[in-house]
């Protein structure tokens, strides 16, 4: 079997990066992209980024959403651009929370 583009390692994807861990970058490259939402001190904290090593995201991406945190993962260039993680509110809102994008 022959192929024109040998695969000697897993593919890396371009991901949107938003949050403290991104530094000055607006993107990162990893084996998985993610979009997360967590509640910190009453604030909705939105973050986006990538897991460079697959194992990093393995557990995180499989964790089901909880009232305090949700993570959505995907594989594909810029696949997390239009993903906004949702908390499992079942239509209810948490009193005293505000939206906050961590830059």
């Amino acid at each position: 079997m022959e192929d024109e583009k040998p695969k000697v390692n897993p593919k890396l994807y371009m991901c949107v990066c938003e949050g403290l861990s991104c530094g000055n970058e607006d993107h990162c490259e990893g084996q998985q992209c993610f979009s997360s939402l967590s509640i910190n001190d009453g604030f909705h904290v939105y973050q986006k980024g990538c897991f460079q090593v697959y194992e990093q995201g393995k557990m995180t991406c499989k964790t089901p959403p909880s009232p305090g945190q949700a993570v959505e993962c995907c594989q594909g260039d810029w696949c997390n651009r239009n993903i906004t993680a949702q908390l499992p509110t079942k239509g209810k809102s948490f009193p005293g929370t505000q939206n906050f994008h961590l830059e």
């Epitope: 079997m1 390692n9 897993p10 890396l12 993107h27």
Partner: antibody, heavy 114, light 113 residues
Framework: QVQLVESGGGLVKPGGSLRLSCAAS????????MSWIRQAPGKGLEWISF????????YYADSVKGRFTISRDNAKNSLNLQMSSLRAEDTAVYFC???????WGQGTLVTVSS | NVVLTQTPISSPVILGQPASISCRSS???????????LSWLHQRPGQPPRLLIY???NRVSGVPDRFSGSGAGTDFTLKISRVEAEDVGVYYC??????????FGGGTKVEIK
């Protein structure tokens, strides 16, 4: 055709610094991630550093972490490796390679000795 | 970190005869995406390495079909069905499963007896 040409090797004293460069041609440089791999005289291959397409992601082997810095200039089609606090065990031929390790330069020899 | 152990260290062979090189990994090289990123490279004296085989058994375009790769999990083999003079040099296995940390085996020197 794809061409990778390393430069910057030479003799340096322990504790010294050196900057290696790799000039790339024959392909769209910004479409590929790049690696530095070294080979001590008469020894095997050791991967030492990786940089992603845009340079946003960098990785280092434990043996060089904190001492070596990889960078790239996509406008100039060049890959760089800044090496500091050099040790005798860093003596090797340093190759730059384009993913998926199908294309390698001829290498540049770095000798660390007093 | 994954450790790759190659055997034998040296393999004197007769032209036209087969040769076999083993590569054993300290842990499974099956990635979560289902692929096994085990490659083989060949390095002639004074030259950079050349990629021969990837994902265990896939030959790179232009590599003669006398080279074949096999194996799974932690045990892999490179076979040369009929050794030719140009096949001398050192063969390395390499894992990319733990990318971006790549690991090479110690190498196997193939020489003509």
């Amino acid at each position: 055709q794809v061409q990778l040409v390393e430069s910057g090797g030479g003799l340096v004293k322990p504790g010294g610094s050196l900057r290696l460069s790799c000039a790339a041609s024959g392909f769209t440089f910004s479409d590929y991630y790049m690696s530095w791999i070294r080979q001590a005289p008469g020894k095997g291959l050791e991967w030492i550093s990786f940089i992603s397409r845009t340079g946003s992601t960098k990785y280092y082997a434990d043996s060089v972490k904190g001492r070596f810095t990889i960078s790239r200039d996509n406008a100039k089609n060049s890959l760089n490796l800044q090496m500091s606090s050099l040790r005798a065990e860093d003596t090797a031929v340093y190759f730059c390679a384009r993913e998926p390790l199908q294309h390698w330069g001829q290498g540049t020899l770095v000798t660390v000795s007093s | 970190n994954v450790v790759l152990t190659q055997t034998p260290i040296s393999s004197p062979v007769i032209l036209g005869q087969p040769a076999s090189i083993s590569c054993r990994s300290s842990q499974s090289l099956v990635h979560s995406d289902g692929d096994t990123y085990l490659s083989w490279l060949h390095q002639r004296p004074g030259q950079p390495p050349r990629l021969l085989i990837y994902t265990v058994s896939n030959r790179v375009s232009g590599v003669p079909d006398r080279f074949s790769g096999s194996g799974a999990g932690t045990d892999f083999t490179l076979k040369i069905s009929r050794v030719e003079a140009e096949d001398v040099g050192v063969y390395y296995c390499m894992q990319g499963t733990q990318f971006p940390a790549l690991t090479f085996g110690g190498g196997t020197k193939v020489e003509i007896k």
